[in-house]
């Protein structure tokens, strides 16, 4: 602790100029004071001034008023500093002395004589307010006031609390009257050394080194550090924890940069054609009649479908076509004939048959020829016989379909089963599902491909009801029940009127 006992001398009256021994001063009492401050004593005794002592120069003769003086000799109020915790009680002895000698240092002069003394004992709290008092004896009167204040940077009731205002990285604070710290705006903590981050800054993912800042830890971003940073290079994905890349719908791959829904994202098929996705960046356009090309971007001639019959020639017009009919035919498509079998209308060895009592005819064409008059060689690809995007190729009198990967059959109508590779070991039954083959394992085996031999047979306990067949290896629980018609449920325990579409997995 550290503080100062301050004593302000105000007025001393010794009208008769007398000493304590009854003698008078000649020519007058040249007065100085000795002050002794010590710990509280019920009865004041001689001995060391434990809290300090001080002397003044000569302040006046006989009676005088003492003016305040802030520096140099004769300073008033008098200062008695202490370096301990102020106990709240004290004893004070003020003695007035006459000196015949030096004004400035009367203490050292021989022949000094006591004029009077006063003793004060009591309690005194630390504070700025002066306590004023006046002491009289038969010859003299002394007016004075006193107080105890804390030294700079000391606070509290006993000046025991050291506090120095600070604004550096070990603290940003001012000192309260009791010596506690009052943090400067933007700072917190016992020593006001912790900055208050930007409001809302994530407690774990963000931090700050100065107020109203929010610095993100690795893997986090955003004003409040509450947004994770996805994997570097993540194109169409998001994260819930840093460095993740969870793909948006329709995207796949490590960086979510493989387009699984090219049709929706890019709409590559033109002119109302149908788009089908087929793996990353793969798609097929199925054109409406009258269009062709990879993206159905090419408009076919209106005459491409050979609408004119009976050898009529087709002429393209702006939005339609016009048939020029050969002699003996009329109608929009030259479908009406003015000819009879007598006119030998059937070409390429076709046989003529009379119709409507000879007013019209019909030609029966030999193989590889077609048309009302057998005038057209058969194009076996016209009817688009190849399914699933297969390519049709004419081969003399016949045609073949070149199938896309994953399809087979004369017309590419068969999907090549994932099960064709017989992926299921140990006699497991293969099921083609959208996401690949699934194996239903016989008793004693499990695993995705029935490759794991299990010592415990999950079917041994007969978990399936109503005559259902039990299989193992299809699920974490190691058995499935394949329900008979009319039953559903994980153990085929519920009767319904609908057949199950796939075995219930237990």
């Amino acid at each position: 602790g550290s503080g100062i006992f301050q004593l302000r001398l105000q007025e001393f009256v010794n009208q008769r100029g007398m000493l304590a021994n009854g003698q008078s001063c000649e020519p007058g009492c040249r007065t100085f004071f000795r002050i002794c401050l010590k710990h509280f004593q019920a009865t004041f005794s001689e001995g060391p001034c434990t809290f300090g002592n001080v002397s003044t120069p000569v302040l006046g003769t006989n009676s005088f008023v003492v003016r305040d003086k802030n520096s140099g000799s004769g300073r008033n109020p008098l200062q008695l500093p202490f370096n301990f915790t102020w106990p709240g009680t004290f004893s004070l002895n003020i003695q007035a002395w006459h000196t015949p000698g030096d004004d400035l240092r009367p203490e050292t002069s021989p022949g000094n004589s006591l004029i009077s003394q006063i003793i004060i004992q009591g309690s005194l709290a630390v504070g700025k307010i002066w306590r004023t008092d006046e002491q009289n004896d038969t010859l003299t009167r002394l007016s004075y006031s006193y107080r105890v204040i804390c030294s700079d940077n000391y606070y509290g009731e006993s000046c025991s609390r050291l506090c120095k205002k600070r604004d550096d990285h070990f603290g940003h604070y001012e000192c309260q009257p009791d010596g506690s710290l009052s943090c400067l705006p933007g700072w917190t903590g016992k020593y006001c050394d912790q900055p208050i981050c930007l409001s809302g800054c994530h407690e774990q993912n963000g931090y700050c080194s100065k107020p109203d800042e929010c610095i993100c830890r690795p893997g986090w971003q955003g004003r409040l550090c509450n947004e994770c940073i996805p994997h570097n290079g993540c194109r169409h994905g998001t994260c819930s924890i840093p460095w993740q890349c969870a793909c948006d719908e329709g995207w796949g791959g490590l960086f979510c940069d493989q387009d699984l829904n090219y049709c929706t994202h890019h709409s590559p098929c033109k002119n109302g054609s149908t788009c089908s996705n087929s793996g990353p960046k793969g798609y097929t356009c199925t054109c409406l009649p009258g269009y062709t090309g990879e993206h159905c971007e090419l408009g076919l001639s209106k005459c491409a479908s050979n609408p004119c019959r009976n050898g009529g020639s087709c002429k393209d017009q702006e939005n339609s076509y016009h048939c020029l009919c050969p002699p003996g035919y009329y109608g929009q498509h030259c479908e009406h004939s003015t000819l009879t079998c007598a006119d030998s209308p059937c070409f390429n060895g076709g046989s003529c048959r009379e119709r409507n009592q000879g007013s019209s005819y019909a030609c029966e064409c030999p193989p590889n020829f077609t048309g009302s008059n057998c005038e057209k060689k058969v194009d076996r690809c016209t009817s688009n016989p190849c399914a699933n995007g297969g390519q049709c190729q004419n081969r003399g009198p016949s045609r073949t379909c070149r199938c896309r990967p994953g399809f087979t059959g004369t017309h590419c109508e068969l999907h090549i089963s994932d099960c064709a590779r017989s992926p299921c070991a140990h006699g497991g039954t293969c099921h083609d599902l959208e996401n690949g083959p699934v194996c239903t394992c016989p008793a004693g085996f499990s695993g995705r491909r029935c490759e794991v031999r299990i010592t415990h047979d999950a079917c041994a306990s007969g978990p399936c009801f109503n005559g259902a067949t039990c299989y193992t290896g299809l699920s974490p629980n190691n058995f499935v029940c394949n329900c008979p018609y009319g039953f559903v449920g994980s153990r085929c325990e519920f009767p319904v009127g609908l057949p199950p579409s796939f075995p219930w997995v237990a």
């Epitope: 700079d152 940077n153 050291l162 120095k164 205002k165 604004d167 550096d168 990285h169 070990f170 603290g171 903590g189 020593y191 050394d193 912790q194 931090y207 700050c208 080194s209 610095i215």
Partner: antibody, heavy 121, light 107 residues
């Protein structure tokens, strides 16, 4: 008990960069109560504070050295490092790392044993 | 630039009191620390926050700080106290050391 250990080359050529690492053991460098400082002492002279760092990466440097100093922290290794660029013979000194305690009002209660770095060609 | 000034040397007889001063502008408004350094060794903190002793430091070491001067006092000085003593304070965000005082214990 907390221990600090400086490591790095004892000889550096003029104009090159001096690099030292301080490894902290027996306590976490990520405590909010401490800063981690570098101090040097040229032969026969007094101490000179170089700079310090908080576990979050906040740094404070001596203005007279600021243009040449970089202090960094690696909390995963419980280490902090000093880099002093463009060195001259005047940078020859014993380099200490120390823990500065907020509770001790910035007093350094733990020091490394020091490592002598000589700048010479 | 904040400067702390110490006398280069102080001599004291065993058992006597040694006082080492450290001067700086308004140093009393800053917290002073004192370090003891023996030849070839790292500094050791002996006083922090003007007058507080870390655990393990003998009671004969005391400190005060007011006005422009901080003082380290070693009462009942022993031969083992012969060392360099350095004061330190913080000026804003910069650590500042005094030049050091060599304490010689006579006899």
């Amino acid at each position: 008990e907390v221990q600090l250990q400086e490591s790095g080359p004892g000889l550096v050529k003029p104009s090159e960069t001096l690099s030292l690492t301080c490894t902290v053991s027996g306590g976490s460098i990520s405590s909010s109560s401490y800063y981690w400082g570098w101090i040097r002492q040229p032969p026969g002279k007094g101490l000179e504070w170089i700079g310090d760092i908080y576990y979050t990466g906040s740094t404070y440097y001596n203005p007279s050295l600021k243009s040449r100093v970089t202090i960094s922290v690696d909390t995963s290794k419980n280490q902090f490092s000093l880099k002093l660029s463009s060195v001259t013979a005047a940078d020859t000194a014993v380099y200490y790392c120390a823990r500065e305690d907020v509770i001790l009002r910035g007093g350094s209660d733990y020091w490394g044993q020091g490592t002598l770095v000589t700048v010479s060609s | 630039l904040y400067v702390l000034t110490q006398p280069p040397s102080v001599s004291v007889s065993p058992g006597q009191t040694a006082s080492i001063t450290c001067s700086g502008q308004r140093l009393g408004d800053k917290y002073a620390s004192w370090y003891q350094q023996k030849p070839g060794q790292s500094p050791v903190l002996v006083i922090y926050e003007d007058s507080k002793r870390p655990s393990g430091i003998p009671e004969r070491f005391s400190g005060s700080n007011s006005g422009d001067t901080a003082t380290l006092t070693i009462s009942g000085t022993q031969t083992m106290d012969e060392a360099d003593y350095l004061c330190q304070a913080w000026d804003r965000d910069t650590g500042v050391f005094g030049g050091g005082t060599k304490v010689t214990v006579l006899g």
